[in-house]
C-alpha cells in the first residue's frame, strides 16, 4: 500500500493554519487499525503517534518551511512511509506603515504620557519596528514582535520632545517608513512678571505708564489681563508668545496695586502685585509716582 502526505493549503502564508493529511488511497481506514505520525525534516510533529490521519498546525511561520512526511503503522507493526513533500511558508512583506499618537492629533501637555503607535496594514512573521525623532532621524527604540502594531512610550513629555517623528517597519524585505508626525508639547503658563515702565525715574501725572507682563514659559497664544486694585484695565494678546504691554495715562487715582494674569487656555497664573505710590517732593509743583 502507498502513503501520501497532503498539505492544505499547499503554499501557506505565515500565521495561517495548515492541515496535514496522511492518505492511503487503496486502504479504507476501517480495513485495519493504523497509527499515524507526522515528521518535519527529522523531527516528529504534534503528539507523535496517533490514530488520526490528520494533523492540524494552528499557525505556520517562515521557519516552518521544510520537508514533511508521514508514517503509518499497522497493529502488526508494519510501517509505511510517504514521500517527502516540500512546504514553503510565504512571508507577506510589510506594507502601509503608519504612525499614530495617543493622545490623538499629536498635541500633548507637558508632563503627560505620549505613546507613538506604529502599525502596518500588512506583514507577517517577526516585524521589527523602529522609532525615529527628527526629520533627520535619531533612533529612539526598536522592537521585534509578531504583531501588526507596536508602541513607543514617553512617560512624561518634556518641551524638548516637540519634534517630528516617524517609524519604520521591517520583516526581511527591506525597511518601510511611515509618514512624518509632528508632536506639539503644550506648556501651561508660568507665573508672569509685571514690570512698570515710566518715561522717567519718577513718573508724573499725565505721563504714560507702560505695564509689561510676561510669562517666561507657556505655549502661545497667551492672553494677558491687566488689573489695578483687582479692577480690569484691559487685555492684550501675544500670538507668538512672549510678553505684552498695556499703556496707561497717569492720573492721581492710579496710585495703588497693579497685577497681571497670563492665560493660554491650559491654566491661568497671576503675577505678584506691584505697588505704585504718589510722592509729593518738597517744593515740587506736581505729584510724582514711585513704585
Amino acid at each position: 500500500a502507498e502513503l501520501f502526505l497532503i498539505a492544505s493549503p499547499s503554499h501557506p502564508t505565515e500565521g495561517s493554519p495548515v492541515t496535514l493529511t496522511c492518505k492511503m488511497p487503496f486502504l479504507q481506514s476501517s480495513d485495519a487499525q493504523f497509527q499515524f505520525c507526522f515528521f518535519r525534516d527529522t523531527r516528529a510533529l504534534g503528539p507523535g503517534w496517533s490514530s488520526s490521519p490528520k494533523l492540524q498546525i494552528a499557525a505556520m511561520w517562515k521557519e516552518d518551511t521544510g520537508s514533511y512526511w508521514c508514517e503509518a503503522q499497522t497493529m502488526a507493526s508494519k510501517v509505511l512511509r510517504s514521500r517527502r513533500s516540500q512546504i514553503n511558508v510565504h512571508r507577506v512583506p510589510v506594507a502601509d506603515v503608519s504612525l499614530e499618537t495617543q493622545p490623538p492629533g499629536g498635541q500633548v501637555m507637558e508632563g503627560d504620557r505620549l505613546v507613538l503607535i506604529c502599525s502596518v496594514a500588512m506583514g507577517t512573521g517577526d516585524i521589527t519596528f523602529l522609532w525615529y525623532k527628527g526629520a533627520v532621524g535619531l533612533n529612539l527604540q526598536s522592537k521585534t514582535q509578531r504583531s501588526l502594531t507596536a508602541e513607543y512610550e514617553i512617560p512624561s513629555v518634556r518641551e524638548s520632545d516637540a519634534e517630528q517623528y516617524y517609524c519604520v517597519a521591517e520583516n526581511g524585505y527591506g525597511p518601510s517608513p511611515s509618514g512624518l508626525v509632528s508632536i506639539t508639547v503644550r506648556i501651561p503658563v508660568s507665573r508672569p512678571i509685571l514690570m512698570l515702565r515710566a518715561p522717567r525715574a519718577q513718573a508724573a501725572v499725565e505721563d504714560v505708564l507702560e505695564l509689561h507682563c510676561e510669562a517666561l514659559r507657556g505655549s502661545p497664544p497667551i492672553l494677558y489681563w491687566f488689573y489695578h486694585e483687582d479692577i480690569t484695565l484691559g487685555s492684550r494678546s501675544a500670538p507668538s508668545g512672549g510678553g505684552a504691554s498695556f499703556n496707561l495715562s497717569l492720573t492721581e487715582e492710579h496710585s495703588g496695586n497693579y497685577s497681571c494674569e497670563a492665560n493660554n487656555g491650559l491654566g491661568a497664573q497671576r503675577s505678584e502685585a506691584v505697588t505704585l505710590n504718589f510722592t509729593v517732593p518738597t517744593g515740587a509743583r506736581s505729584n510724582h509716582l514711585t513704585s
Partner: antibody, heavy 119, light 112 residues
Amino acid sequence: QVQLVQSGAELVKPGASVKVSCKASGYTFTSYNIHWVKQAPGQGLEWIGWIYPGDGNPKYNEKFKGKTTLTADKSTSTAYMELSSLRSEDTAVYFCARRIHYYDYFDYWGQGTLVTVSS
Amino acid sequence: DVVMTQSPLSLPVTLGEPASISCRSSQSIVHSNGNTYLEWYLQKPGQSPKLLIYKISNRFSGVPDRFSGSGSGTDFTLKISRVEAEDVGVYYCFQGSHVPWTFGQGTKVEIK
C-alpha cells in the same frame, strides 16, 4: 504618480512681494517635508528651508530668515514660499522638492519658478 | 556653515572614458546619529536636479550602475565608469547633516 507642480514665472518690481506655489499630488501631502531651493542665474543651488505640511511648522536657513515665509495648505496639498522686499539679487529660479525621511534624499522636484525682479 | 568645495569646476570628458568629481566639506558631515548625509545630484540644462547617490554610496533607483559614490568624513567622490552622452550637465554634491544644509558650487561635465 508623485508630482510637484509649481506656479508660473513672475516679473516683479523691487520692494514688492511674490508668492510661489508648489502643488503636490500622488502621495499623502502631510507625510513628508517640502523644501525650497534657490538657483540664481548661472549660479549653483542654495537651500532655503523646509516646511512640514502636517502642522505648518517651517525651518529656515538663517540667510533667508526675514526674506522668505514658508506656508502650506493641507486642504489643497499646496506649499507656498513668499519672498518679500524684493531686490535684484532675489532674481532666481526657485525649486520646491520633497525629501524622504529615513532614506534621506530629495526624490521629487518641482519644475522651478523663475522670479525676475526688475523695475 | 559647512562649505562644500567641488573640483574640478569644469570637466571635459571623452565618451566611454571614466570621470571623477571630488567634493570636500569644510568640517566633518557625520551626523550625531552616525549617518553621513552626502548626496549627489545631476542637473541638466533647463531641468530640475535629479538624485543620483544618497548617504555617500547608495545609488538611487533607476540610476545606472556606472555611477558610484565613495568617501568618508570630509572627502567624497563621484565616479562615472564610462561616460555616456546623457551624462552631461552640472553635478552637485549636497550635505544634509548640519543646518544650514549646503550644496557644492557644481561641476560642469561636457563632452570633449
